[in-house]
Interface confidence: medium
């Protein structure tokens, strides 16, 4: 059976430590770098540009803008060449909650 | 070998020079020529992990791309009336 447009096989999930964590509360968005890079001297890029002053596993944006702050994020450790990428697009609002 | 994310009209598409591999998350629809995965409407908050198909020797050059949409379709504004 060949692959078709409207179907796809379930593939093995990657281990949780390789995933970014995205937390959104009000207008604040916090992106956490995957565990695989450890805790020391993390570098962040946004749309291939180095984010100055960001060296923690968490990258926090207090007033996230969907237009200006959505895009490609990457984090990596100096000791590990491999980068992890996240494409994030988020719409935020100050006084709202998300209901399922 | 990096997955690129494109938005056209109201939909989200992932593209590679080779083909897009879904690791987990939103299934998507494989479009002709296998280079593009249609993740559907962005208001449905597609999320998942994807990478470009590569040979074993080149797999280290094909990083994972996590996709995270949160379009707040189910967001409820809290004002004094809502809280009352």
């Amino acid at each position: 059976q060949d692959e078709d447009f409207k179907a796809s096989d379930d593939l093995t999930s990657i281990s949780p430590e390789k995933r970014f964590k995205v937390s959104i509360s009000g207008t604040e968005v916090v992106v956490t770098c995957p565990d695989v890079f450890g805790y020391d001297n993390i570098k962040w890029e946004k749309n291939d540009n180095l984010v100055e002053g960001a060296s923690n596993r968490e990258l926090s944006q207090k007033e996230f803008s969907e237009v200006d702050d959505s895009g490609y994020y990457a984090c990596y450790a100096d000791s590990i060449k491999e980068k992890s990428y996240l494409y994030l697009r988020a719409r935020v609002c100050a006084n709202c909650i998300e209901v399922n | 070998f990096k997955v690129s994310v494109e938005e056209l009209e109201d939909r989200v598409f992932l593209s590679c020079n080779t083909s897009v591999l879904r690791i987990e998350g939103t299934m998507g629809i494989q479009l002709p020529h296998s280079r593009t995965l249609d993740l559907g409407k962005r208001i449905l908050d597609p999320r998942g992990i994807y990478r470009c198909n590569a040979t074993e020797e080149q797999s280290d050059k094909a990083p994972y791309m996590q996709v995270y949409y949160r379009m707040c379709q189910n967001c409820v504004e809290l004002n004094s009336a809502t809280l009352a």
């Epitope: 060949d2 692959e3 078709d4 447009f5 409207k6 | 002709p32 020529h33 296998s34």
Partner: antibody, heavy 118, light 109 residues
């Protein structure tokens, strides 16, 4: 408005190579679209032959004797079909295929009849 | 490789509905395009992705696709709809476009 125009010989001898060109005006031959050749033998249906999009992809039925190239400077793409037989007598169409999100043949040439005969 | 089956010919009375079918193994899992080709002319796209109609194509043309059959429907056939109709899918296994053999529609006055 994009227009495609096939050109080439109307008559080819058996065992010879067919060379057809599709000139494009009102748009550019680039890698962002798929540039296809389709043929239709007399009284028969449409048969996809292959495309160029920077790289090429051919119908396995023609594999080994087909070549599609493009000259982006001249805004044209070409078909070469080797070892022609009378079975290759057909109307040959060039067609542009749209890219994401649609992928269908939106513009066609009017077709050129190629007869294989000695 | 993937095979699409169409009836060679179909007759329809003027202003009556016409249903042109295209059969294929689990075709409902694929996306189907339909082309109209009038005598001596190049094909024209009339339905894409099963049921979408390009700009300029009359509303009487519609499409559906499920199971092993895709269907092109002309709600009320006109004389100008007399043509050959071809279905098309992408065969992801062979990495090739596949056309049906075509159905010749005749509109009876």
């Amino acid at each position: 408005e994009l227009t495609l125009q096939e050109s080439g010989p109307g008559l080819v001898k058996p065992s010879q190579t067919l060379s057809l060109t599709c000139g494009v005006s009102g748009g550019s031959v680039t890698r962002s679209h798929y540039w296809n050749w389709v043929r239709q033998r007399p009284g028969r249906g449409l048969e996809w032959m292959g495309y160029w999009t920077g790289s090429t992809n051919y119908n396995p039925a023609f594999q080994g004797r087909i070549s599609i190239t493009a000259d982006t400077a001249k805004n044209q793409f070409s078909l070469q079909l080797r070892s022609m037989t009378t079975e290759d007598t057909a109307v040959y169409f060039c067609a542009r295929e749209t890219t994401i999100p649609t992928f269908f043949f939106d513009y066609w040439g009017q077709g050129t009849l190629v007869t294989v005969s000695s | 490789s993937y095979v699409l089956t169409q009836l060679p010919s179909k007759n329809v009375t003027l202003k009556q509905p016409a249903h042109i079918t295209c059969g294929g193994d689990n075709i409902g899992s694929k996306s189907v395009h339909w082309y109209q080709q009038k005598l001596g002319q190049a094909p024209v796209l009339i339905i894409y992705y099963d049921s979408s109609r390009p700009t300029g194509i009359p509303e009487r043309f519609s499409g559906a696709n499920s199971g092993n059959t895709a269907t092109l429907t002309i709600s009320g056939a006109l004389a100008e709809d007399e043509a050959d109709y071809y279905c098309q899918v992408w065969d992801s296994g062979a990495k090739a476009w596949v056309f049906g053999e075509g159905t010749q529609l005749t509109v009876l006055r």
